[in-house]
């Protein structure tokens, strides 16, 4: 159950991280692993987690799992996982990181941090 | 270094109120989760609450409605407020940085005595 | 509740032997093929210490003797040379489903 008044420095702080991984992109992220897309909805930060977790040796995402983990730190139960846990398409982890991106400045904007 | 350290446990009458605190240092606070974990004297370790770096809460049911866990990002210390207090409630209780599900608590504090005894 | 339970629940060892702890979930606690399992140590009077996350994953800063192992319902945790300093009680926890609950534990005494 959320606070009433979370803080937004968490996404702030993921969101920065996303930045500069896909900014400063020079070779194929994670050695061009796959990972499960996603429709990144209500537990997105769950769902990113579970997908990035199945990358290993991959030191540049360490921070965004840590910073996922942070703002997820417990499993979802199943009565509130939908359509984001669907796992039909695989994607390159660069990709993944900016679609995540683009979905955290949204909710950044929107104001509704959890 | 990772340093957690408790106050505010006592002793208090069924019923009662106490409010514990725990001071966070050594590692940037408002990135990580943050939990309390609790053990009964001579007794194994049951997880009390938990709040997320973006402030959502989680707790068993043993506590719910009882017990509410919070932090102050600006002071770095997470805090947990316990009301309606009864025998059972009764532990050390331990604040921990929590990495999440996948990581488990990563570091501990040394806890502090809560005895809810009349 | 996810139920865990430990075994054995104390055991008698001498420095050097290896000791083998087991932990069995009343369901699985794997998650997308990662099990959510954890180890902790703890010492009389202090506070717990993670030693194991993810089944099998050792914890920086933690001696190689310890391992895990075991996915679903059945893990492991073993000690292939006891040291002096592991005598203590381990504990198993989940954290596949809320709430979160821990293993009995095991305690590790001295022969």
């Known amino acids: 159950s959320p606070n009433p008044v979370p803080s937004s420095s968490s996404l702030k702080e993921l969101i920065e991280e996303l930045v500069n991984i896909t900014q400063n992109q020079k070779v194929p992220l994670c050695n061009g692993s796959m990972v499960w897309s996603l429709n990144l909805t209500s537990s997105m930060y769950c769902a990113a987690l579970d997908s990035l977790i199945s990358i290993s040796n991959c030191s540049v995402i360490h921070r965004t799992k840590r910073m996922l983990s942070a703002l997820c730190p417990h499993k979802p139960s199943a009565k509130h996982v939908s359509s984001e846990y669907v796992r039909d398409t695989k994607i390159e982890v660069a990709q993944f990181l900016k679609d995540l991106l683009r979905h955290s400045r949204i909710i950044f904007r929107n104001g509704s941090y959890n | 270094e990772v340093q957690l350290v408790e106050s505010g446990g006592g002793l208090v009458q069924p019923g009662g109120s106490l409010r514990l605190s725990c001071a966070a240092s050594g590692f940037t606070f408002i990135s990580y989760a943050m939990s309390w974990v609790r053990q009964a004297p001579g007794k194994g370790l049951e997880w009390v609450a938990s709040i997320s770096s973006g402030g959502n809460t989680y707790y068993p049911d043993s506590v719910k409605g009882r017990f509410t866990i919070s932090r102050d990002n600006a002071k770095n210390s997470l805090y947990l407020q316990m009301n309606s207090l009864r025998a059972e409630d009764t532990a050390v209780y331990y604040c921990a940085r929590l990495d999440g599900y996948y990581f488990g608590f990563a570091y501990w504090g040394q806890g502090t005595l809560v005895t809810v005894s009349s | 509740d996810i139920q865990m339970t430990q075994s054995p629940s104390s055991l008698s060892a001498s420095v050097g032997d290896r000791v083998t702890i087991t932990c069995k979930a009343s369901?699985?606690?794997?998650?997308?093929?990662?099990?959510?399992m954890h180890w902790y140590q703890q010492k009389p009077g202090k506070a717990p210490k993670l030693l194991i996350y993810r089944a099998s994953n050792l914890e920086s800063g933690v001696p190689s003797r310890f391992s895990g192992s075991g996915s679903g319902t059945d893990f492991t945790l073993t000690i292939s040379s006891l040291q002096p300093e592991d005598f203590a009680t381990y504990y198993c926890q989940q954290s596949n489903e809320d709430p979160w609950t821990f293993g009995g534990g095991t305690k590790v005494e001295i022969k």
């Open positions: 369901e699985s606690v794997d998650n997308y093929g990662k099990s959510l």
